[in-house]
């Protein structure tokens, strides 16, 4: 996911709605003009603001990367919601890309957790119940099972 914090607003195009600030703040979906006199609407699909604010610029919409699906589009008041495609996941320590989930557990282990957009399948030892470290096993060692469906 890529996002820049501030999207400098170009000169207000005719279609950009203007209204007056209320107690110095502009409503969600707007930002304040430099002179503080007007509220200028964010551009749908390009930028947004989430709260009553005195921001000089709206925030730039996130664009989903390839390998991600867009669950909810960017509106003037909400950012995009992106999620890894089915069968892939994004780890906390490598948030920059979606990685393929393993298709099965090593021999002697059982699957106790499905592939989700945030985690690989979870495997535990049959006897001890201890978790597997997470390294993908060699193909001939796997007990295959279909990856879980990402939560929508």
């Amino acid at each position: 996911i890529t996002q820049q914090d501030l999207a400098p607003q170009q000169r207000a195009a005719p279609q950009q709605k203007r209204s007056s600030p209320s107690e110095g703040l502009c409503p969600p979906g707007h930002h304040i003009s430099e002179d503080g006199r007007d509220c200028i609407s964010c551009k749908y699909g390009q930028d947004y603001s989430t709260h009553w604010n005195d921001l000089l610029f709206c925030l730039r919409c996130t664009r989903c990367d390839s390998g991600e699906v867009e669950l909810s589009p960017c509106t003037t008041t909400r950012n995009t919601v992106c999620q890894c495609e089915e069968g892939t996941f994004r780890e906390e320590d490598s948030p920059e890309m979606c990685r393929k989930c393993r298709t099965g557990c090593p021999r002697g282990m059982v699957k106790v957790g499905d592939c989700t957009p945030w985690s690989d399948i979870e495997c535990v030892h049959k006897e001890s119940g201890t978790k597997h470290s997470g390294e993908a096993p060699a193909v001939e060692e796997t007990v295959t099972s279909s990856p879980g469906t990402p939560a929508s």
């Epitope: 914090d5 110095g24 703040l25 989430t50 669950l71 008041t77 909400r78 950012n79 919601v81 929508s152």
Partner: antibody, heavy 120, light 107 residues
Framework: QVQLQESGPGLVKPSQTLSLTCTVS??????????WSWIRQHPGKGLEWIGY???????YYNPSLKSRVTISVDTSKNQFSLKLSSVTAADTAVYYC????????????WGQGILVTVSS | DIQMTQSPSSLSASVGDRVTITCRAS??????LGWFQQKPGKVTKRLIY???SLQRGVPSRFSGSGSGTEFTLTISSLQPEDFATYYC?????????FGQGTKVEIK
Amino acid sequence: QVQLQESGPGLVKPSQTLSLTCTVSGGSISSGGHYWSWIRQHPGKGLEWIGYIYYSGSTYYNPSLKSRVTISVDTSKNQFSLKLSSVTAADTAVYYCARDDSSGWGFDYWGQGILVTVSS
Amino acid sequence: DIQMTQSPSSLSASVGDRVTITCRASQGLRNDLGWFQQKPGKVTKRLIYAASSLQRGVPSRFSGSGSGTEFTLTISSLQPEDFATYYCLQHYSFPWTFGQGTKVEIK
């Protein structure tokens, strides 16, 4: 991992001002896009949003409490604070601080909460 | 203000049960709704945002659905750690408002 911790007196006398502070760790209060809120929960009841502040100091309050509420921020200490004036027994509640996620989808991190009792 | 009507206010269920909690809004919210779990002595946890998106780290047995005025939180197979109180939050318009809560108890 962002963590929020409320602090302040657990007992306040009627007509006085309730003062609480929320200390943020694991992230900067000045990180763009995040708004910082106070929420309260009356004993055995539901949750009520009080208001929020942005790191720049701009605030927005629940109209039902607006006349009595002040929220302020101290970016150097990574803290934001709540003041509620002219308290009565009806202000007895657990007070929570929380962070609004920067994408506009509500609160993503909450504090543990602090019980404040208004009694003489 | 937008009123959020949550039902039921409490329910008793067993481990393994499928549990459904509903929130109705007094006006349309698009998908500007979240679900939260509250346990005594624990930090309140967001489960679902944008009506149906699962928060990172939340088990996939939790799911959310709905848009407009009617929303549902479903726990597909209740686990011992799921006994808690659940709240919905509308953040479509200020002031943001919560449902009254649903306490999920052990049968």
